[in-house]
């Protein structure tokens, strides 16, 4: 029969014949002959293969440097790898998380739309009429004006996106 | 039937280099992987490396940088190299042929008798 | 390295009794893919080189008695000679054949008390 140009999912070519890949956790240690299959080896400690593969050495876990500001979300195994994450009140600078940065604060005047966690920042909404934040914070959301009229009070002084109203007594009119 | 058979010098002066061959028969070296592993006098069993059947090997690391492991098919022989020798590697070397289970697991089926070599001036 | 200790390191059982051997690994040998484990068991009679008996954990090499069996998962492994005989005296050695390097247990001497 005429030798394969193409092979099979989880098979891959090599002397014209078409041999098993090694499965994920697994790497090549003897490609396939006519008398005998692929001969595969786990991976060993802090070493991963997430696919099936014809690698001839695993892949090392990725380190996560705690100088960096990096800790283990979650741990490797022989078919994943480690994932990292950042220390409370950092996150990561890319998606692949190699290193981290302090979480940006909202500035006065602006509000926390949305709070950072270990992969994403701080992400600030300017506060709108009617709401002020008068702190630079990672946390703090705008807070609504005081309302004068449910305390039967009076605006004294207008609010500002960085600052409250000011209430203060209505004015007696005398008879 | 499967046959190994170790052979070498049974003493070697310190520093110098251990060489040892496994001849085997009833089966090809490019069919199956061998072994090394020794065994010093009345202790356990330490791995030294192997020759997968592919040719390509892997190594004990803490013998890594003093061993070689090679083969020659068409004499169906594996040769042992360890270098720069001393008395801590006074030992039975043994050669074992490798077999292979699928899914990764190889276990070693067939073992030569082994060989003493004393390490010593 | 993976470092596998047996215990105990001597064991005394008379004839037509079962014995037990445990081996420990520093790590996990279960392969969460596959869930097979890797541990193999060797007997070595005086003068003689080792025997394999057990790869996979319990599979048992062809021609091994059934008296003998392997069990265990993940870090912990025992075999078990279910009607010790005569021949049965030798040292036992486990193996894990997870990865290289390939290490042995510093193995367990098995006597007819």
């Known amino acids: 029969p005429e030798p394969p140009t193409a092979c099979r999912e989880k098979q891959y070519l090599i002397n014209s014949q078409c041999c098993s890949l090694c499965q994920p956790g697994q790497k090549l240690v003897s490609d396939c002959t006519e008398f005998t299959e692929t001969e595969c080896l786990p991976c060993g400690e802090s070493e991963f293969l997430d696919t099936w593969n014809r690698e001839t050495h695993c892949h090392q876990h990725k380190y996560c440097d705690p100088n960096l500001g990096l800790r283990v979300q979650q741990k490797g195994t022989s078919e994943t790898d480690t994932i990292c994450t950042c220390e409370e009140g950092w996150h990561c600078t890319s998606e692949a998380c190699e290193s981290c940065v302090l979480h940006r604060s909202c500035s006065p005047g602006f509000g926390v739309k949305q709070i950072a966690t270990g992969v994403s920042d701080t992400i600030c909404e300017p506060c709108p009429v009617g709401f002020f934040s008068n702190v630079s914070s990672a946390f703090e959301k705008c807070h609504p004006w005081t309302s004068c009229e449910t305390k039967d009070l009076v605006v004294q002084q207008a609010g500002t996106n960085k600052t409250d109203v000011v209430c203060g007594p209505q004015d007696r009119l005398r008879a | 039937q499967v046959q190994l058979q170790e052979s070498g010098p049974g003493l070697v002066k310190p520093s110098e280099t251990l060489s040892l061959t496994c001849t085997v028969s009833?089966?090809?070296?490019?069919?199956?992987?061998l072994h090394w592993i020794r065994q010093p006098p009345g202790k356990g069993l330490e791995w030294i490396g192997v020759?997968?059947?592919?040719?390509?090997?892997d190594y004990n690391p803490s013998l890594k940088s003093r061993v070689t492991i090679s083969k020659d098919t068409s004499k169906n022989q594996v040769s042992l190299k360890l270098s720069s020798v001393t008395a801590a590697d006074t030992a039975v070397y043994y050669c074992?042929?490798?077999?292979?289970?699928?899914?990764?697991?190889?276990?070693?089926?067939?073992w030569g008798q082994g060989t003493l070599v004393t390490v010593s001036s | 390295d993976i470092v596998m200790t047996q215990s105990p390191d001597s064991l005394a059982v008379s004839l037509g009794e079962r014995a037990t051997i445990n081996c420990k690994s520093s790590?996990?040998?279960?392969?969460?893919?596959?869930?097979?484990?890797?541990l193999a068991w060797y007997q070595q009679k005086p003068g003689q080189p080792p025997k394999l008996l057990i790869y996979?954990?319990?599979t048992r090499e062809s021609g091994v008695p059934d008296r003998f069996s392997g069990s265990g998962s993940g870090t912990d492994f025992t075999l078990t000679i279910s009607s010790l005989q005569a021949e049965d005296v030798a040292v036992y050695y486990c193996?894990?054949?997870?990865?290289?390097?390939?290490?042995f247990g510093q193995g367990t001497k098995l006597e007819i008390k």
């Open positions: 074992a042929k490798n077999s292979y289970y699928g899914q990764g697991g190889h276990a070693m089926d067939y």
């Open positions: 009833g089966f090809s070296l490019t069919t199956y992987g």
């Open positions: 020759i997968w059947r592919g040719g390509n090997t």
């Open positions: 790590q996990s040998l279960l392969h969460s893919f596959n869930q097979k484990n890797y």
């Open positions: 996979f954990t319990s």
């Open positions: 193996q894990q054949h997870y990865t290289t390097p390939f290490t």
